[in-house]
């Protein structure tokens, strides 16, 4: 039963963390104005990962597309890049994780195949988690060096041609967002790897349970489970009694750890 | 089409008060009082989101003048208190457009403060 | 808050001839978001209530005569009437829209000569 909580919890989290991670990286407010001692602004900036937009008192909302590649920072592809890789190994963990589902049956798959699953897509959110939190994290940096640097100068001038007032950005709320996106994706991918120990069929748990007879060698679990004879390669473990009634978690082809506990 | 229809203009005592109305039909986001003292230039006076209820003033009018609105009537308001000499003006209600520009304008109300 | 400085003041002029106001700003209007001023001009007729003319320093409003066109970045600005008519002689108001205080020139009274 803890199992499956765990694994059902585990893709929930992550599937909630890859909608935020999306949601982030499709979000314009990655860094907004900052109104310091102004609360109210007429003229109000904030900018995203493909497009920087301006809102006006007026209720008028202009936005405008980054339609250059090269001539963007290298820091902005580098956070744009982490993004999408994220949310590419997440979708992809997603995949892999529906199909690991223990409540989910898909033909004759075995609990091994399963566990295998199971932990490629917990790497595949922790990865994914980090990739988030590395991309919102290089921006958030950016955004720190720059406010700084717009402090220490708050006029700039292009060429002696245009004078322009420095604004200063800070975080929006695209940051946060992500940061706990990419934390709750993180969280999943643990919580899927942890499962995938309490699917995974490890032979070493009869090793160290089992007494040697003097003439053939027979490994006992606790809860009505027997072992073939010998340490070879057992195809399947017969159960030779039936304990009462069982939940679904219970009714497996191989004995987990969690059986041990 | 925007109309706007400034009303509640008079005579009133130094240190006195009044309410000003502008009642508004069409779309309106936000809203802006500006006056016009006789033979002299332009003065903006405050702004509302006409939605969210935020405001500003210029600071010769905080404290002193307050900018609100009323849904159910569509009205825009300017209460004016502690009257001066100097507010005497004809006052008009715009709305702000692209650009933060004044579009619509209503034909004004003239305040007098005098004795 | 920000000044704004009209010049000049008055200015006479004739039907047909070429007519240029200038706004100069104390801060920039220039917004880096979106690289547009906002600086906006207005024209007032005695008796009434102002007519929008011109946004973002340059954007001329749908309805107004292409005679009228503006230009400037930065803190200077510039409105030009190319060709004088008798309906335009009126007193011309710039406003910076950047920032609150919204903030107005004293105004150009233009005159017939």
């Known amino acids: 039963m803890a199992v499956t909580a765990c694994q059902g919890l585990g893709f929930v989290v992550s599937l909630i963390g890859i909608a935020g991670i999306i949601a982030a990286t499709c979000m314009d407010q990655w860094s907004t104005q900052d109104l310091y001692n102004n609360p109210v602004t007429a003229v109000f900036n904030y900018q995203g990962l493909w497009r920087s937009c301006v809102r006006e008192s007026s209720g008028f909302t202009e936005c405008r597309g980054y339609f250059t590649l090269l001539g963007l920072p290298a820091m902005l592809q580098a956070v744009r890049a982490l993004m999408i890789v994220g949310i590419v190994l997440g979708a992809i963990g997603l995949l892999v994780s529906i199909f690991a589902l223990k409540c989910i049956r898909i033909g004759s798959m075995e609990d091994s195949a399963k566990a295998n699953m199971t932990l490629t897509s917990g790497i595949m959110f922790i990865v994914s988690g980090l990739c988030a939190i590395a991309g919102v994290s290089v921006f958030a940096n950016m955004l720190v060096t720059n406010f700084w640097m717009s402090t220490a100068n708050m006029y700039t001038g292009m060429g002696g041609m245009v004078q322009t007032v420095q604004t200063r950005y800070t975080f929006g709320a695209a940051l946060f967002v992500g940061w706990v996106a990419g934390g709750l994706t993180l969280i999943g991918g643990v919580m899927m790897c942890i499962a995938c120990r309490g699917l995974a069929p490890e032979e070493t748990n009869y090793k160290a349970v089992s007494y040697h007879a003097s003439g053939h060698s027979v490994a006992y679990k606790p809860g009505g489970f027997k072992a073939s004879t010998g340490f070879g390669s057992n195809t399947k473990n017969k159960k030779i009694y039936d304990g009462g009634a069982r939940t679904e978690d219970e009714v497996q082809s191989y004995p987990s750890k969690h059986d041990y506990v | 089409e925007v109309q706007l229809v400034e009303s509640g203009g008079g005579l009133v005592q130094p240190g006195g008060s009044l309410r000003l109305s502008c009642a508004v039909s069409g779309y309106t986001f936000s809203m802006n009082w500006v006056r016009q003292a006789p033979g002299k230039g332009l003065e903006w006076v405050a702004w509302i989101n006409m939605y969210t209820g935020e405001k500003t003033y210029a600071d010769d009018f905080k404290g002193r003048f307050t900018i609100s609105r009323d849904d159910s009537k569509n009205t825009l308001y300017l209460q004016m208190n502690s009257l001066r000499a100097e507010d005497t003006a004809v006052y008009y209600c715009a709305r702000l457009y692209n650009g933060n520009s004044l579009d619509y304008w209503g034909q004004g109300t003239l305040v007098t403060v005098s004795s | 808050d920000i000044q704004m400085t009209q010049s000049p003041s008055s200015l006479s002029a004739s039907v047909g001839d070429r007519v240029t106001i200038t706004c100069k700003s104390s801060?920039?209007?220039?917004?880096?978001?979106?690289?547009?001023?906002?600086l906006t001009w207005y024209q007032q007729k005695p008796g009434k209530a102002p007519k929008l003319l011109i946004y973002?320093?340059?954007t001329l409003v749908s309805g107004v005569p292409s005679r009228f066109s503006g230009s400037g970045s930065g803190t200077d600005y510039t409105l030009t009437i190319s060709s004088l008519q008798p309906e335009d002689f009126a007193t011309y108001y710039c406003q910076n829209a950047y920032s609150f205080p919204f903030t107005f020139g004293q105004g150009t009274k233009v005159e017939i000569k």
């Open positions: 801060q920039s209007l220039l917004n880096s978001g979106n690289w547009k001023s906002y």
């Open positions: 973002w320093a340059s």
